[in-house]
């Protein structure tokens, strides 16, 4: 019973992590710069993301520009893009592996095989969490290094954007969820599959509610 509950919690956390990761990768808020001129009229905020940059004027008007050439982009930005996409795909793969081994599915009948699949999915989610963490920490490190570099001009200095915090949250949720799935797999078990089917059916809607907790309209 506890094992099933931990599995549900684990997969819900990883789904929330995946959604967080998706939002983090998509939003142009990795680096934030505030340019304040002599007059408040020219005050503007620049948001930089993996795919585009946006300028928000003091009037509230926002203009976004998608980065043109892939080859012209800095290597660290290309790497961050790649890692973000890979992390999301790896997490999706983890979800498929989990679904194949979940106690409420009939893809695999044998209990040991199911347990192994759930364990594998947990490991895959942990890997996804680590992959999410790398570009976020790398970008944060660069921002902090610039902040303390006396030869980097004030206008070139950035602040940590909301996407980085979302990325850390995503990584944490994927690591925690994956860890829980790894912990719920002692081989063998006395409960029958029908028992869990009932438990899962009542919990299923909770999964679909996860993403709505992050209102992306606030960010874009």
């Amino acid at each position: 019973m506890a094992s099933a509950g931990m599995q549900i919690l684990g997969v819900v956390l990883t789904l929330l992590g995946w959604v967080n990761g998706l939002v983090s990768c998509a939003l142009p808020m990795w680096k934030v710069t505030a340019f304040i001129g002599n007059s408040i009229v020219v005050a503007q905020v620049v948001w930089e993301g993996l795919w585009m940059s946006c300028v928000v004027q003091s009037t509230g008007q926002m203009q976004c520009k998608v980065y043109d050439s892939l080859l012209a982009l800095p290597q660290d930005l290309q790497a961050a893009r790649a890692l973000c996409v890979i992390a999301l795909l790896v997490a999706l793969f983890g979800l498929l592996v989990y679904l194949a081994g979940a106690k409420c599915t009939t893809c695999v009948e044998e209990k040991d095989s199911k347990a192994r699949l759930v364990l594998t999915s947990g490991i895959v989610f942990v890997i996804s969490g680590v992959l999410t963490l790398i570009p976020v920490c790398w970008t944060a490190h660069a921002i902090i290094r610039d902040f303390y570099n006396p030869l980097v001009a004030e206008a070139q200095k950035r602040e940590l954007g909301a996407s980085l915090y979302l990325g850390w949250a995503a990584s944490g949720l994927l690591l925690l969820g994956g860890g829980l799935l790894c912990c719920t797999c002692p081989s063998g078990g006395s409960q029958g599959p029908s028992h869990y089917m009932a438990r899962y059916s009542t919990s299923a809607p909770a999964i679909s509610r996860g993403p709505s907790e992050y209102p992306t309209k606030n960010y874009v």
Epitope: P74, N149, P150, L151, A153, A155, Q156
Partner: antibody, heavy 119, light 107 residues
């Protein structure tokens, strides 16, 4: 117009001390990072020291750490470089430099003051 | 310490020609590189920062580029007033170091 005028250079014996000054004018001194860079007789440029706008943080290369001290007086719009335990390899033209809000690196250079360490 | 290897040490070209000065960092410095110009008897002047960005007032015939740890300063349509020493400098981490300089002359 940004103006940086260095003074205090001269001939000094090895092991001796010297204090360089840099008088800044034409801009508000407080908000800017300031540095000293020297140019050896062989025309090589060497970064000497940097001080943050408030003066709270200072940055030195190992070659001068413990021997040179940078300071600033924001009220007097003046930058200082106290040099002690001078060596012959410290012989150089010393430039006072101001950073910039928009540009990275050493944005504005003074005309320099010559320091000669010799017996 | 990060070493900056600048080449060539000296360069002679005709007015109107295109010249390129290169600078290689001994390790990764991202785009934390500046170029300076020093005319005879004068102090150095900042030309380029962040490896590619030109300082206001610098003629557009000057351009900076980066490929990994190799950086270049290109001068298109060389003018007589471009006669000077050119230095690269990294500001990735302390200590900040300069290249040995390139002396540019007109033929």
């Amino acid at each position: 117009e940004v103006k940086l005028v260095e003074s205090g250079g001269g001939l000094v014996k090895p092991g001796g001390s010297l204090k360089l000054s840099c008088a800044a004018s034409g801009f508000t001194f407080n908000p800017y990072t300031m540095s000293w860079v020297r140019q050896t007789p062989a025309k090589r440029l060497e970064w000497v020291v940097t001080i943050s706008s408030g003066g709270g943080r200072t940055y030195y290369p190992d070659s001068v750490k413990g021997r040179f001290t940078i300071s600033r007086d924001n009220a007097r719009n003046t930058l200082y470089l106290q040099m002690s335990s001078l060596r012959s390899e410290d012989t150089a033209m010393y430039y006072c430099i101001r950073g910039d809000y928009r540009y990275d690196g050493f944005a504005y250079w003074g005309q320099g003051t010559l320091v000669t360490v010799s017996t | 310490d990060i070493q900056m290897t600048q080449s060539p040490a000296s360069l002679s070209a005709s007015v109107g020609e295109t010249v390129t000065i290169t600078c290689r960092a001994s390790e990764n410095i991202d785009s934390y590189l500046a170029w300076y110009q020093q005319k005879q008897g004068k102090s150095p002047q900042l030309l380029v920062y962040a490896s590619t960005l030109l300082v206001d007032g610098v003629p557009s015939r000057f351009s900076g580029s980066r490929s990994g740890t190799q950086f270049s300063l290109k001068i298109n349509s060389l003018q007589s007033e471009d006669v000077a020493r050119y230095y690269c400098q990294h500001y990735y981490s302390i200590p900040y170091t300069f290249g040995s300089g390139t002396k540019l002359e007109i033929k």
